[in-house]
């Protein structure tokens, strides 16, 4: 018996087609993805093949103005229109709190939304009961398939799930649910979830009874053969893991932003064992037409967005590199721009001794969600900025000891190279890392811009001195693993909305040209 699994993950509000780098579509003939194009391809496959499942591995929420304005209603509407069969909860589904998940999505979705390792407690337990499930058994042709969901246990550090949801270890939570499905004679089981490729592989290895793992969160691109676009494969598609009980378990992920449709064909024997698996992500480029009916619906929903955010704020004459390939690995000029805006927003001439009360900014690279192309006449709109800073956070003022900052910069590179979001972009700071040293001892130079000076210059960080720093509220609250900031901050004052800070700065400057200028170096 053959099953076709179509899958998406980390779509992040890319309902409309995008440029190749997943930013706003500029040249329509070269644009990719979007739900109208996705629907064309899905329907084509559904017509051609008998047993098809369309699955999403989480993080539909957050990423463009679509989410800023519609807050998840757009996700439910268009996923319903595409007839998704199931979705796993991602960490970003909690960005607007539990209510922001329940009302627009959980109550409106016509497909099951899954997570086995999220347990509700307190007053929320009865309110959310049945709105998401640990697993769902789906009819596919004459057979049934069990889909069991999971969500990153780091979600409380990455989003806003509140205090009444407990995120358990994925493997510990999944095993009893899979066992239950086996007891119920469901012998074809897909683990669908949002914890990243490393966890996906562990699930394939450790959870007895899981036949296929469909993942997300790490934006992993897998491909067999010559890749069709710019993404470099992290491995073959599917990635085969040998489980502890000796089975070959295919693991897949489909990059992000709706640029690809994952396409996996699995052949099962009569006992539900995987005999073979093959496939590849399908690049959703302009050779695939956008479905006219879905496109018309998109255009109808788009009207509200146009009113919201299409006025020009200012211009850029350089490419604003907000790609994860840059901002999670090295100094990026988008990070510099945002940090400069954050400092500018906090200019308060204190007295004759201080040129300003604060000179430093830190910003998690993972919070920068999109680049901005200067080739669109250099125009920057609120909409562009909403794709870069989609989380609706604030840029806050904290007071920290130098020793805490040093710990933060060590944390910034403690697992460098895995494209994780904690890599820090900076302003008013010069940092030098030596990655040949062991984690926790990689910061070899950390100089900070003086405030008590008439001519600002960089001096070595002093461990016992108290510094003011501007940072996202996400970091102040210990997000991305920066627990030391949350635990050790001496004062925290909440600030202005992030997009507003940057838009005000761009409007003030009129023309911007941020550079990469040696704020972050590697020795």
């Amino acid at each position: 018996w053959e099953l076709t699994i179509l899958h998406t993950n980390d779509v992040h509000s890319r309902l409309e087609q995008t440029s190749e780098d997943s930013s706003k579509c500029v040249n329509a003939s070269r644009c990719m993805g979007g739900v109208a194009r996705l629907f064309t391809k899905v329907q084509q496959i559904r017509r051609a093949e008998p047993n098809v499942l369309l699955l999403d591995a989480g993080d539909q929420y957050q990423g463009t103005i679509w989410f800023t304005v519609y807050k998840g209603a757009e996700v439910a509407h268009f996923m319903n229109a595409l007839r998704y069969d199931a979705m796993a909860l991602g960490n970003h589904e909690f960005d607007n709190g539990v209510e922001g998940l329940i009302e627009p999505l959980l109550k409106e979705a016509k497909f099951p939304i899954l997570s086995a390792n999220i347990k509700a407690k307190g007053p929320l337990a009865s309110q959310i009961s049945g709105l998401y499930l640990p697993y769902k058994v789906l009819p596919v042709g004459d057979e049934v398939v069990g889909i069991v969901g999971y969500t990153s246990k780091e979600t409380p550090f990455l989003s806003n799930p509140g205090t009444n949801l407990v995120f358990e270890d994925e493997i510990t939570a999944l095993q009893p649910e899979v066992d239950k499905l086996k007891t119920l004679n469901v012998n074809k089981i897909i683990a669908l979830g949002h914890s990243g490729f490393e966890t996906d592989k562990l699930i394939a290895q450790k959870v007895r009874g899981v036949d296929v793992v469909v993942g997300g969160h790490s934006n992993t691109f897998l491909y067999t053969g010559n890749p069709p676009s710019k993404e470099v494969p992290a491995g073959k598609y599917p990635f085969i893991v040998t489980s502890d009980d000796g089975r070959k378990v295919p693991v897949v992920q489909a990059y992000a932003f709706g640029k690809y449709l994952g396409y996996l064909k699995i052949e099962f024997d009569e006992r539900g064992n995987v005999i073979s698996s093959h496939g590849n992500p399908i690049l959703l480029n302009s050779s695939i037409p956008e479905d006219p009916s879905i496109k018309a619906d998109i255009n109808k929903w788009r009207i509200k967005l146009d009113n919201y955010s299409t006025q020009e704020l200012g211009k850029t004459i350089v490419y604003l590199d907000g790609s994860s390939q840059s901002c999670r690995f090295r100094e990026c000029n988008m990070g510099n721009l945002i940090c400069d805006a954050m400092i500018n927003n906090n200019l308060r001439h204190a007295d004759e001794m201080f040129w300003n009360h604060v000179s430093m900014c830190i910003l998690n690279g993972g919070g920068i969600r999109s680049p901005i192309d200067e080739r669109n006449n250099g125009t920057i709109t609120w909409e562009n900025l909403a794709a870069v800073l989609p989380f609706g956070g604030t840029f806050d003022l904290v007071q920290l000891k130098g020793s805490t900052l040093k710990k933060a910069f060590e944390h910034s590179v403690h697992r460098y190279g895995q494209s994780t979001g904690e890599f820090l972009q900076v302003g008013g700071i010069h940092v030098v890392y030596d990655l040949s040293r062991k984690p926790g001892d990689r910061v070899v130079k950390l100089d900070v811009l003086c405030t008590k000076c008439r001519v600002p210059s960089y001096d070595p960080l002093k461990m016992d001195e108290i510094y003011k720093v501007i940072l996202p509220n996400f970091l102040a609250n210990g997000g991305d693993g920066f627990q030391m900031i949350k635990d050790e901050l001496l004062r925290h004052d909440s600030g202005d909305q992030d997009i507003n800070v940057v838009s005000t700065y761009i409007s003030k400057m009129k023309v911007i040209y941020p550079a990469v200028e040696g704020r972050i170096k590697f020795s």
Epitope: D85, K110, F111, P112, S129, G130, L133, P134, Y135, K136, V137, L138, P139, V144, K180, L181, T183, L184, N185, V186
Partner: nanobody, 128 residues
């Protein structure tokens, strides 16, 4: 081989009663949410009543509330639908369905999501 087999249908006069049975073979109904659905000629299939396996909570469509009663006998691996005060508009093919997923009885009956197991149906005709 998993099977749901409905029985008990037939011709009944308006105001009369019938008891439908749904017998399961190949799986234990204790772990399943079970639903009775019906489809009248030229109409969409609709959920009539559903019962959970765990707490035996029940759900009834507004059109049958107070007239139909769903129950289950796990020892016999059977679910029943007691129908009384029958009306002409109750005429339909009645289907039994089962889902091992932990869906609510309301979600099962709407049905909000696809249901994996179905019987072949039994015809109920209410006519004088």
């Amino acid at each position: 081989q998993r099977q749901l087999v409905e029985s008990g249908g037939g011709l009944v006069q308006p105001g009369g009663s019938l008891r439908l049975s749904c017998a399961a073979s190949g799986f234990l109904l204790d772990y399943y949410v079970i639903g009775w659905f019906r489809q009248a000629p030229g109409k969409e299939r609709e959920g009539v009543s559903c019962i959970s396996g765990s707490d035996r909570s029940t759900y009834y469509a507004d059109s049958v509330k107070g007239r139909f009663t769903i129950s289950r006998d796990n020892a016999k691996n059977t679910v029943y639908l007691q129908m009384s005060s029958l009306r002409a508009e109750d005429t339909a093919v009645y289907y039994c369905a089962a889902d091992p997923s932990p869906v609510t009885v309301q979600a099962m009956c709407l049905p909000r999501f696809p249901v994996p197991y179905w019987g072949k149906g039994t015809l109920v005709t209410v006519s004088s």
